[in-house]
Interface confidence: medium
């Protein structure tokens, strides 16, 4: 399977909410011994590999923001901790998963990464991620609502396998 990032850039005004999205592509095994671990974190554009460094989002680590479920099951974070920080991650039946950030500030600008680990118990883990940039703007040049920029077809299938 692969992870696609439908949008590579989100430009939002301060105070707005934004939902960053990734999508699982390709065959998803629905076997009872296969589960998916999905999460989000901030990173930097490394010289070798994007998304290698895992930084917190609003002081919450990728461990705090995880979703864990079987194939094609819906899930969302019910963590009070995440919601207190204006964050919520969610996953639907169609392979889409997202993180919603409320009341954006300039400090939220940066590179965001989604991570999916397919866990085949007794056997292996397969890891893929996607990256997107969030720019929060203020002042007269800021858009009135979030503007999203589609990924090129090459960028939208941002694949890294363990």
């Amino acid at each position: 399977f692969k992870v696609a990032t439908p949008y590579s850039l989100y430009v939002c005004p301060e105070g707005q909410n934004v939902t960053l999205t990734c999508r699982l592509l390709g065959p998803v095994d629905k076997g009872h011994d296969v589960t998916f671990y999905k999460t989000w974190y901030r990173s930097s554009r490394g010289e070798v590999q994007t998304c290698s460094e895992r930084r917190p989002i609003r002081n919450l680590t990728f461990q705090d923001l995880h979703l864990h479920h079987g194939g094609h099951q819906a899930a969302n974070t019910s963590h009070d901790l995440a919601q207190r920080h204006g964050l919520e991650s969610a996953s639907d039946h169609h392979g889409n998963f997202s993180i919603t950030m409320r009341n954006l500030t300039l400090l939220d600008s940066g590179l965001y990464c989604c991570l999916v680990v397919e866990i085949r118990h007794h056997h292996s883990e397969h890891r893929v991620h996607g990256a997107m940039e969030l720019q929060v703007q203020t002042g007269k040049d800021a858009p009135s609502n979030c503007v999203v920029y589609p990924s090129s077809s090459q960028d939208s299938e941002n694949i890294t396998a363990a």
Epitope: D33, T35, Y37, T39, V48, S52, E53, R54, F62, Q63, H66, H68, H79, L115, V117, I119, H121, H122, H123, S124, E125, R127, A161, A162
Partner: antibody, heavy 118, light 106 residues
Framework: EVQLQQSGPELVKPGASMKISCKAS????????MNWVKQSHVKNLEWIGL????????SYNQKFKGKATLTVDKSSSTAYMELLSLTSEDSAVYYC???????????WGQGTSVTVSS | QIVLTQSPAIMSASPGEKVTMTCSAS?????MYWYQQKPGSSPRLLIY???NLASGVPLRFSGSGSGTSYSLTISRMEAEDAATYYC?????????FGSGTKLEIK
């Protein structure tokens, strides 16, 4: 604060079995795998296996199949490792450690010393 | 299973000296992880995903490598760095550790 508190040292007789506990606190127990590692007197670290509190799934190092049995009690956020038919070669320090998928073992218990002797 | 061979087995360094130790894998691995262990203590995560510092790890530590060859470097040795260092892989079951490099202070 993340903590993994293991049960105390054990002196057991050859042929006996025993169970080590690892009580987790300060994090979401079901969001991690609980891993067990053996460190013998020669100081080598060996991965025994893991259990997912999320669904009870286990994966074992083939070397420890039949020697170690991993279980969890979600209600008390406690992981257990039972060691069977102990011999002197099982004398070691055993650690539990949490691991997020796609990451590393970032928190470890303090270790449980097991001595097998008659 | 993937065998991780660490070298040297034992080394010593003076304070302020640069230290490099290596970990060679019998088959290619995607990422390497490094742990530090001091006598009487549990292992501590130092480096994840080959080159990233775990929380609270001093900036003098760094990791690099790919495929079958990885290394851990301490830019300037300090007395508190005296310990045994283990590499570890999560790429293939069973997950394995190297045999360790014991670093002593001169």
């Amino acid at each position: 604060e993340v903590q993994l508190q293991q049960s105390g040292p054990e002196l057991v007789k050859p042929g006996a079995s025993m169970k080590i506990s690892c009580k987790a606190s300060g994090f979401s127990f079901t969001g991690y795998t609980m891993n067990w590692v053996k460190q013998s007197h020669v100081k080598n670290l060996e991965w025994i296996g893991l259990i997912s509190p999320y669904n009870g799934g286990t994966s074992y190092n083939q070397k420890f199949k039949g020697k170690a049995t991993l279980t969890v009690d979600k209600s008390s956020s406690t992981a257990y490792m039972e060691l069977l038919s102990l011999t002197s070669e099982d004398s070691a320090v055993y650690y539990c450690a949490r691991r997020a998928y796609g990451y590393a073992m970032d928190y470890w218990g303090q270790g449980t010393s097991v001595t097998v002797s008659s | 299973q993937i065998v991780l061979t660490q070298s040297p087995a034992i080394m010593s360094a003076s304070p302020g000296e640069k230290v490099t130790m290596t970990c060679s894998a019998s088959s290619s691995v995607s990422y390497m992880y490094w742990y530090q262990q001091k006598p009487g203590s549990s292992p501590r995560l130092l480096i994840y995903d080959t080159s990233n510092l775990a929380s609270g790890v001093p900036l003098r530590f760094s990791g690099s490598g790919s495929g079958t060859s990885y290394s851990l470097t301490i830019s300037r040795m300090e007395a508190e760095d005296a310990a045994t260092y283990y590499c570890q892989q999560w790429s293939s079951y069973p997950f394995t550790f190297g045999s360790g490099t014991k670093l002593e202070i001169k």
